[in-house]
């Protein structure tokens, strides 16, 4: 048994679960899903045994291995995968153990505005980047970019002091989850700061 | 240094197939997105695709999803363009290209590796 | 696929000449624009991105505007070193597209 391997996917993609077997005379072999049984394999009469009819399409064993491809990735396919070789000329299963991560697609971020203030000329207000749908595992980086400027900064949150007069600014938020990254329509110091001068309140953006 | 070195180019008959490698150093390769970018001679860019850093997403050009596949080694750093039924249109030099920063624009590029599709 | 058309497809101009080259995207694209050129013989260089901001080591004589689908590659004073072919980058979405290029000679 080796250490657990870790898997990545994308919602909608396809992840292969590797299996090397040393094992010679293999009777079957169990791929179990959270300790729900996945699949059976009997090589000896080629007997593949899918449990549930609803993973039949999504579940298959390229090149004539025993590696599970699984394609049709949802986000519940998450979670723990375990494979058992049983065979008689051993007296312990051979056993692998998986931790498969379904990531999905990320889509433009969002980006709020927080309360805002207007003084000496100075505008000030933080932008708050965000996805829709609450994605999980998903980090944030905002691009300034301007004439004196070009800075990145980790965070969802983007601290922003602008100065009227000053050459204009652009604010960009990237998204990245471990599958794909994104990033939001670009934001304008120059008309963030006119529209937050008239309504003080938080907004979209 | 920052660099990317392609090889595996060169003569192939129309229909055959080619491996293209492209070997990174001076960065960490395995935190990167990667893309393969061709230009036919004389011609523009085009950009054939790009893989993430773990291969769980690999995006392609819909021209050419089905007879290009894209695969990286961390482990080698190295990066990995398979070309199947190969024709004369293909005839290009082959990139391996870095997005500056893991965004979408590329600022290192590998010298390039000539393939040649003809009988 | 967004299609990036390039104008002029060659040009020549003077040194200390103004040059102007414009990429036209067939739908928005925010401003998820680069810039690049490239030498005869050599491989591309990013010059810009996000429409208008250089790469770090890019000569302050290029420069980048636009946003949507109109965007600008100006080079305020050409110099001999700048024959190239140019190239702008789309990649507001996918698959990321290339214009035809701009071929700049030098009269």
């Known amino acids: 048994s080796g250490p657990v391997k870790e898997l990545v996917g994308s919602v909608g993609g396809a992840v292969t679960f590797p299996l090397k077997s040393k094992v010679k005379q293999v009777d079957s072999i169990v791929w179990t899903f959270n300790t729900t049984p996945l699949v059976t394999i009997q090589p000896e009469g080629g007997t593949i045994i899918v449990t549930q009819n609803r993973n039949r399409e999504r579940v298959d064993f390229p090149d004539g291995g025993y590696s599970l491809k699984l394609s049709k990735l949802k986000k519940n396919d998450s979670g723990i995968y375990y494979v058992g070789i049983y065979s008689s000329s051993l007296q312990q299963p051979s056993t692998q153990e998986y931790v498969l991560h379904v990531y999905e697609h990320l889509s433009k971020p969002k980006v709020t505005m927080g309360l805002q203030s207007n003084k000496n000329g100075t505008c000030v207000t933080n932008l708050t980047c965000c996805m829709e749908h609450g994605e999980e595992d998903v980090i944030y980086t905002w691009k300034a970019l301007g004439q004196a400027a070009n800075e990145s900064h980790n965070g969802s949150i983007l601290p922003i002091s602008w100065r009227w007069g000053e050459s204009d600014m652009t604010f960009i938020c990237v998204a990245r989850n471990p599958v794909s990254r994104n990033f939001s329509s670009p934001i304008l110091a120059r008309k963030l700061c006119e529209g937050a001068a008239d309504d003080p309140d938080s907004s979209m953006v | 240094e920052v660099q990317l070195v392609e090889s595996g180019g060169g003569l192939v008959q129309p229909g055959g197939s080619l491996r293209l490698s492209c070997a990174a150093s001076?960065?960490?390769?395995?935190?990167?997105?990667m893309s393969w970018v061709r230009q036919a001679p004389g011609k523009g860019l085009e950009w054939i695709g790009e893989i993430n850093p773990d291969s769980s997403t690999i995006n392609y050009a819909p021209s050419l999803k089905d007879k290009f596949i894209i695969s990286r080694d961390n482990a080698k750093n190295s990066l990995y363009l398979q070309m199947n039924s190969l024709r004369a249109e293909d005839t290009a030099v082959y990139y391996c290209?870095?997005?500056?920063?893991?965004?979408?624009?590329?600022?290192?590029w590998g010298q390039g590796t000539l393939v040649t599709v003809s009988s | 696929d967004i299609q990036m058309t390039q104008s002029p497809s060659s040009l020549s101009a003077s040194v200390g000449d103004r040059v102007t080259i414009t990429c036209k995207a067939s739908?928005?694209?925010?401003?998820?624009v680069a810039w690049y050129q490239q030498k005869p013989g050599k491989v591309p260089k990013l010059l810009i991105y996000?429409?208008?901001t250089r790469h770090t080591g890019v000569p302050d004589r290029f420069s980048g505007s636009g946003s949507g689908t109109d965007f600008t590659l100006t080079i305020s004073s050409l110099q001999p070193e700048d024959v190239a072919t140019y190239y702008c980058q789309q990649y507001s979405s996918y698959p990321y597209t290339f214009g035809q290029g701009t071929k700049l000679e030098i009269k």
């Open positions: 996000w429409a208008s």
């Open positions: 290209a870095r997005p500056d920063g893991n965004y979408w624009y590329f600022d290192v």
């Open positions: 739908q928005d694209v925010g401003i998820a």
């Open positions: 001076g960065f960490d390769f395995s935190r990167y997105w």
